[in-house]
Structures are given as C-alpha cells and as structure tokens.
Amino acid sequence: EKSDLRTVAPASSLNVRFDSRTMNLSWDCQENTTFSKCFLTDKKNRVVEPRLSNNECSCTFREICLHEGVTFEVHVNTSQRGFQQKLLYPNSGREGTAAQNFSCFIYNADLMNCTWARGPTAPRDVQYFLYIRNSKRRREIRCPYYIQDSGTHVGCHLDNLSGLTSRNYFLVNGTSREIGIQFFDSLLDTKKIERFNPPSNVTVRCNTTHCLVRWKQPRTYQKLSYLDFQYQLDVHRKNTQPGTENLLINVSGDLENRYNFPSSEPRAKHSVKIRAADVRILNWSSWSEAIEFGSDDG
C-alpha cells in the first residue's frame, strides 16, 4: 500500500516502523528498558493505546482505521535515558482520489456485495482493489470477483465468507499511472451488515376456533440462535377496503416459532406473511410469500 511514513525523532532513534498488513508497530529494543508505551493519535485527537507485546518492543493495534491519517508515538525509558519518537502515517496521494461511499451487505446467508464510487478527483485510469482481513488477522481475502463500471472496479462480490469473523477490516487501495491514489479503510461488523432472508416453511392450520401459524427461522451467515430473532406477522383480511389497517403482530423468537390466534368458522379469506430481524438491531428482512387461508364466502 502506498503511504509515506515520516519519522520525527531525536538524535538517537528508536527506528520505529509500522506494518499496515499486521497493524504492528515495532521499534529497536533498548537494553535495560524500565518503561515502554506506544499509542496513536488520529485526526480527531482520539488516542488509542494497545497492550505491549511480550517482548515489549512492539505493539499491535486491533481495531483502527488509517485513511484519515494517524500519528504513532513510542515512549521508552531505560535505566540511562528516555527515548521518544513519533511516526506520521499520512494517507498519501491526491486528496479526493480514494474510493468513497463504501458499503457492504451480506445476503442469502453466504454471499456478500461491497460497492464504492470512484473518488471525485481520481484520474480516468484509476483502478481500485479490495482486501479484507478478519479481526484475528490470520488471513487476507482479496476480492475474487470485481463489479466494473467502464473498466474501473466499483464493487466486489464474494461467494465464500468462510474467512470472515464477526468484525472485519476492509481496505480499498487505488493505483494510477498518473498520480498517487489515496486508500480507504473501514471496520464493519457482520451483524450490522447482514440482510436476513424472510422466514421459511410458513404454514397455517386452522380448526373451528383458531388458526396456528408456524415458521422456521431464516438461515443466516451469523451464528444466531432462536432468541436472537424477532418476527413480525402481517395478518391481512382479503378484499377489505383500501386504507384498512393491517394487523401487525410482534413475536419473539422461540425454539418452535408459532402464533395462535382466534379465528372462528366460517372465516373470510385471509393472508399471512412474516418477516424477521435481529432482536437487537431490528433490521427487517423482506416479507415472506403471502400464505392464504379461509374462503371467499366466509
């Protein structure tokens, strides 16, 4: 990734270096070290201070974005003297060339699309590349299928999400023969970007006095269990006047998803459809296909 690393240091340098692939900041170990500290300051003056690695000459930043530019700083005391060094990590390249409007969503439980737009000042020959690293940083995923607009990559389709974890780091690099292109990076939670399918296996069974609706929770990319779901049922009487209120019923997820409601014979024609959401986010899925029950002459 193209980025100028500029060191601001006193005469005897710690030789601070940063590897953006591993997010590891390291420096030359000093003999008889009594104190070490590393941190970064971002453009909004927020400070992030990770734990030092066991050897105390490096530290790893877990959840940080770098595209706005950051300054790393290392403080080391030895029994003889103190060291201090700053490392500027700017997002080099022409302002406004980075990918923008970046977003991703997971759908159908195991597919993901990411899209972005070319930067407003990016040259015509700009090309963007997407890399994804999971929170454990054990592997990097390169985009396997790019979505293109006039030859420029403006999106990515992934059909294998096995390398992702619950939180992932997305990096869009850019190249051009004309000028330096800035990068864009983002941290995304899979639970916040997943769009659920509607519930499946929706059935309605009625007796003389009640109707019982049953359904199965949707298959999801996240490992969710039954308590993580909230459902909404839309029970709708057919052939009613326009503007008549639909009955929307909220139901918490259960091991056996069911909703029993009074409906006596003869019963008019009704339809029921169901949608699902994560109970904590309420990002509703689309509605399931409507199931009809009852009769026209009810």
């Epitope: 974890t165 619950s166 639970k191 269990s225 308590l227 993580d228 091991l255």
Partner: antibody, heavy 120, light 110 residues
Framework: QVQLVQSGAEVKKPGASVKVSCKVS????????IHWVRQAPGKGLEWMGG????????VYAQRFQGRVTMTEDTSTDTAYMELSSLRSEDTAVYYC?????????????WGQGTMVTVSS | QSVLTQPPSVSGAPGQRVTISCTGS?????????VSWYQQLPGTAPKLLIY??NKRPSGVDRFSGSKSGTSASLAITGLQAEDEADYYC???????????FGGGTKLTVL
Amino acid sequence: QVQLVQSGAEVKKPGASVKVSCKVSGYTLTELSIHWVRQAPGKGLEWMGGFDPEENEIVYAQRFQGRVTMTEDTSTDTAYMELSSLRSEDTAVYYCAIVGSFSPLTLGLWGQGTMVTVSS
Amino acid sequence: QSVLTQPPSVSGAPGQRVTISCTGSGSNIGAPYDVSWYQQLPGTAPKLLIYHNNKRPSGVDRFSGSKSGTSASLAITGLQAEDEADYYCATVEAGLSGSVFGGGTKLTVL
C-alpha cells in the same frame, strides 16, 4: 415440545471417569448447540463448555481443559459430557442446556440435571 | 469468587416490587456485553428469565431487566410465593469463551 432428558445419578470413585448423556426430543440435535454447566451442592452455576460457532469447535472452560470431553451422536440426538480424573470437588449436579443466543452465551432451555457424587 | 457480584439474599412481601443487582466490570458487563438472568426454584434446573439485558422469553412476565454501565438489575413486580428461588445473572468475560455467572441471590418471600 422440545425437551432435554439427562441420564440418571452416578456415584464414582476418585480418579474414575463419568459420562453424562443428554437426549434431545422434539428437535434434531444438528439444529441446536448444547452447552454444559455444573453446580456443586449449595454453590452457584459454573460453565464447563460447549460449541462456539466463532471457533467452529467445542470449547472448554480453562479449568476443565484436558479433563472434559463433549461429544454428540446425531443419529440418536444425544449429547455427552465425559469428565475424567474425578475428585471430591467434582461432586455436583451437571446440566446440559440449549443455546438461545451466542452473543453473549445465553442458555434458553435446560435439562433436569444429573447428580454425580465422587466419594471413596 | 465470581467476577459478577450479587447480594447473597433479598426479601420482600407478597405484592411488593424487589430488585436484584449484579455488578461487574469493564471487562464484562461494561465491555459492553449483554446480561441474562436465570431463576432456579428449589431442587429444579435453572430457567431463563431475561436475555439481551431486557428481553423476556415467551411465557415470562412480571420480570424485567435493565443495564447501566458495569451493572445490571432484575426487577420482580407483584411478588408471589412461587418467586422464592435463587436468581443468577450471567454475561461474558472479555477474552474468555462461554459464560460467567454471578454468585446467586436467594429471594425470600415474607
């Protein structure tokens, strides 16, 4: 109606092993995740282990590591917990439970418990 | 010694409202991880009462949960004799798998 039915009480000698079973009815085991929790007499609840989807494997509480093995027989919808090198402090009621949520771990439905007594 | 601290006992008269506290730290409740609550009637298995801090499973009423900072609490309204039981809070400890439970609170209905 989903139910978890555990095996009967056991009395074991120190150093021996015990294997507790947990049969699921009204659901298939492959659609569920089972965890195990124990409770010593007059004491609180202690998580032992179970399936972690993030790791995609069964994970164990550190203090039981190397002594406990959790397995599943999907053909009979039965989960098992085996604890070896038993000592008197392992005397407890052992519960299996169905995970209702993974984040954080929430146990939605519990078995009736199996009393394991370790005594010489 | 549990990382979640609960009062050993609380009591209340029938019809009253009682609350049970659960105090953690920045590495569990304050991390922030959601809290769940379990009821254990004498001689029976625990039963889930509250999950995701304040959600109730179907069939549970009169019980409500809340969370603020590094603490959570369980409130029981309209206390009844059958509420006499042990109550446990639970959450996750950062860096550890599984669940951590509070030490439990014995509720006595006077």
